[in-house]
Interface confidence: low
């Protein structure tokens, strides 16, 4: 069975459990030739697009979305989608961002490293959004 555009992956640096006020960067990855990466929240209720795409490897491109100061409102599920002209890819798996109060205790780790959601072999749903709505008040480089 031929594949369509490969599914993107999403990861978070330094992790998915982020102390209040700290920063987090979502990393979306897809094939080479991607024109636009989109980071979506909660079933496309809000999203951010970037054309600042870099080549991560000979066969992979990536975009980074940074939130400088995480608030409780940033918690929730995130996923990536990309546009490789003239088509949109499927969505990545969801990645859940958790925001925790800073207790300052030495035993409480700041982050949960190595968290990512990669492509699956046969996704059950291909969502295709040819005419996506305009970015809903989000700044070009930051979600909030």
């Amino acid at each position: 069975q031929e594949e369509d555009l490969p599914r993107p992956s999403i990861s978070a640096e330094p992790g998915t459990v982020i102390p209040l006020g700290s920063h987090v960067t979502f990393v979306c990855r897809g094939p080479v030739g991607v024109q636009t990466f989109r980071l979506e929240r909660e079933s496309r209720s809000t999203y951010n697009d970037t054309e600042d795409v870099s080549q991560a490897s000979p066969s992979e491109s990536e975009a980074r979305f940074r939130i400088d100061s995480v608030s409780e409102g940033n918690a929730g599920p995130y996923r990536c989608i990309y546009y490789k002209p003239p088509k949109w890819s499927e969505q990545s798996d969801y990645l859940e961002l958790l925001v925790k109060e800073t207790s300052g205790g030495p035993d409480s780790p700041d982050t949960e490293p190595g968290s990512s959601a990669g492509p699956t072999q046969r996704p059950s749903d291909n969502s295709h959004n040819e005419h996506a709505p305009a970015s809903q008040g989000l700044k070009a480089e930051h979600l909030y």
Epitope: D4, P31, G33, P86, N126
Partner: antibody, heavy 122, light 107 residues
Framework: EVQLQQSGPEVLKPGASVKISCKAS?????????MNWVKQSHGKSLEWIGY????????SYNQKFKGKATLTVDKSSSTAYMELRSLTSEDSAVYYC??????????????WGQGTSVTVSS | DVQMIQSPSSLSASLGDIVTMTCQAS??????LNWFQQKPGKAPKLLIY???NLEDGVPSRFSGSRYGTDFTLTISSLEDEDMATYFC?????????FGGGTKLEIK
Amino acid sequence: EVQLQQSGPEVLKPGASVKISCKASGYTFTDYYYMNWVKQSHGKSLEWIGYIYPNNGATSYNQKFKGKATLTVDKSSSTAYMELRSLTSEDSAVYYCARDGYSSNYYTMDYWGQGTSVTVSS
Amino acid sequence: DVQMIQSPSSLSASLGDIVTMTCQASQGTSINLNWFQQKPGKAPKLLIYGASNLEDGVPSRFSGSRYGTDFTLTISSLEDEDMATYFCLQHTYLPYTFGGGTKLEIK
């Protein structure tokens, strides 16, 4: 074997509408494929009308054919349709459906229907 | 829209000749170019995709190349069955656009 079987020739009067069908077989209609429609006027080149994504019905049209062509699918019968409305002599042409396959990171119109001739004459 | 300027519009060649035809894109840096062969009364048949990739089952005498926005289809040794019209298609930018065609005749 992948096959796209189109409906037969049509002779219509100006102002009429017509719905052309394209029945797909030999592959999973709703898997990762788009269906394109292409117009070829007599002795002329090819014009892309638009595509439809059978999985969810999403469409994209050439601006030139917006309001003229409407693309739909019936997933249960693996059939794509193109309706042309308000026909004029300019719409007389052969219309093809063509599947968008995906090979080695490239989209390709790899399989084509045999074409449906539409003649508009008073 | 991206215009695809195809030349020549017709050409005549002898069996065994090397034949070339070109398509020039009006814009676009990373175009996925397809070449098709069409015989009278038949649907187009895919020959080349991605500018230079040969479709399965297509004879190896057909090849495609790209230099910037110029794309070339070459038939290395013309055979009788190659008499047809050839079209290019840019399959990257919406709307997709075809070249005007090159009608190839055998001398």
